[in-house]
C-alpha cells in the first residue's frame, strides 16, 4: 500500500482541526481565494486539490497534511481528478467551512468514505 504507515487522521481529528482553525475567524490565509470543489467526488482528495495551492499560511498546513494522508489512503488516489468548479473561486475559510459541514455530516451518518 502506498499509504503512510502511521494510522491516518480520523474523521474526528479532522473535524477538530477544522473547528480549531475556523472558530472566531472571519478570514484565513489573508483572504486567499481557491477553486470551489464538489466534495461529494471524494472529499479528501477534492478538498486537497484546491487547498494544496495555498502557501505561506501556517494555519492551514495541518489540515493540508491531514487531507494528504487521508487522500493517500484511497486506491489510486493520485489518479482521480475531482470535479472542480474552474469558474468559481471562494475564500479559503469558506472552503474549510464547507468541508467542515460536509465532514460532520459524513461523521454523523457513519459513512466513512
Amino acid at each position: 500500500s502506498p499509504s503512510p504507515v502511521t494510522p491516518s487522521p480520523t474523521l474526528k481529528e479532522l473535524i477538530e482541526e477544522l473547528v480549531n482553525i475556523t472558530q472566531n475567524q472571519a478570514s484565513l490565509c489573508n483572504g486567499s481565494m481557491v477553486w470551489s470543489v464538489n466534495l461529494t467526488a471524494g472529499m479528501y482528495c477534492a478538498a486537497l486539490e484546491s487547498l494544496i495551492n495555498v502557501s505561506d499560511c501556517s494555519a492551514i498546513q495541518r489540515t493540508q497534511r491531514m487531507l494528504k494522508a487521508l487522500c493517500s489512503q484511497k486506491p489510486a488516489a493520485g489518479q482521480i481528478s475531482s470535479e472542480r468548479s474552474r469558474d468559481t473561486k471562494i475564500e479559503v475559510i469558506q472552503l474549510v467551512k464547507n468541508l467542515l459541514t460536509y465532514v460532520r455530516g459524513v461523521y454523523r451518518h457513519g459513512n466513512f468514505r
Epitope: 502511521t6 495551492n53 495541518r62 497534511r65 489518479q79
Partner: antibody
Framework: EVQLQQSGPELVKPGASVKVSCKTS????????IYWVRQSHESLEWIGYI???????TYNQNFKDKATLTVDKSSSTAFMHLNSLTSEDSAVYFC????????????WGQGTSVTVSS | DIVLTQSQKFMSTSVGDRVSITCKAS??????VAWFQQKPGQSPKALIY???NRYTGVPDHFTGSGSGTDFTLTISNVQSEDLADYFC?????????FGAGTKLELK
Amino acid sequence: EVQLQQSGPELVKPGASVKVSCKTSGYSFTDYPIYWVRQSHESLEWIGYIDPYNGGTTYNQNFKDKATLTVDKSSSTAFMHLNSLTSEDSAVYFCATAVVATDVMENWGQGTSVTVSS
Amino acid sequence: DIVLTQSQKFMSTSVGDRVSITCKASQNVRNAVAWFQQKPGQSPKALIYLASNRYTGVPDHFTGSGSGTDFTLTISNVQSEDLADYFCLQHWNYPLTFGAGTKLELK
C-alpha cells in the same frame, strides 16, 4: 532566520542503533513539522515527519521498522533514532522544515553522516 | 508510491545556455512538484514549489513549469554557479518521493 543544527558524524557497528539530533532556532518550533530525509548514492528518500505540536508522526513505509521520530519541545530539538543498523543504512541523514509550502522542505540541517561498519 | 523519473542523469551545458531538466510522475500529481539544487558537500536548496513558484532569493533565470505528470525546470542563461545536481519532489501524496536527480555539468 530559520536554522537547523544537526549532531555530528557517527561510526557504528552493524546491529547497533544511533540517535541523530536536530536543534532548531529562528521560529516557533511547534508551528511546523520536522522532516527527515536520507541521502545515499546521491538519491534522496523521505523518511517521515513529526509534528512537534502534538507529537504526531507519519512515516514512509520503507522506514517504519528502522526510524523512530521524537521531539523535545523544551529545547526545540527533534531526534531520529535508527535501529538494527546495517551497511545499507550508511548515508547522510538530513532534518528539514517546510514553512512556505506544505511538505516542501526549504530549510535544511547540514546533514549527519552515519557510517555502519564492523 | 508515486515514482518520479528524471530521464537524464547528466546534462552538459555551456555558460550562457538555456537548459531544461524534466521530471515525469507515474501518476497525476496536479501541480505539487518542487525542485531542489544540491552542490557537492552541501544540503539541498529549495528553488521552486507548486511547479512554478520561486522561493525568495532564487534568481529569476530559474523557471518551473508543468502540471499533471510532466514537469520542467528551465535554467536560462546558465551561470557557472548553477552547475549542480537538481532533484524534483512530488508533494501531492504520501510518501513524498524524489526524482533520482540530474547533474548539470560543463560541456
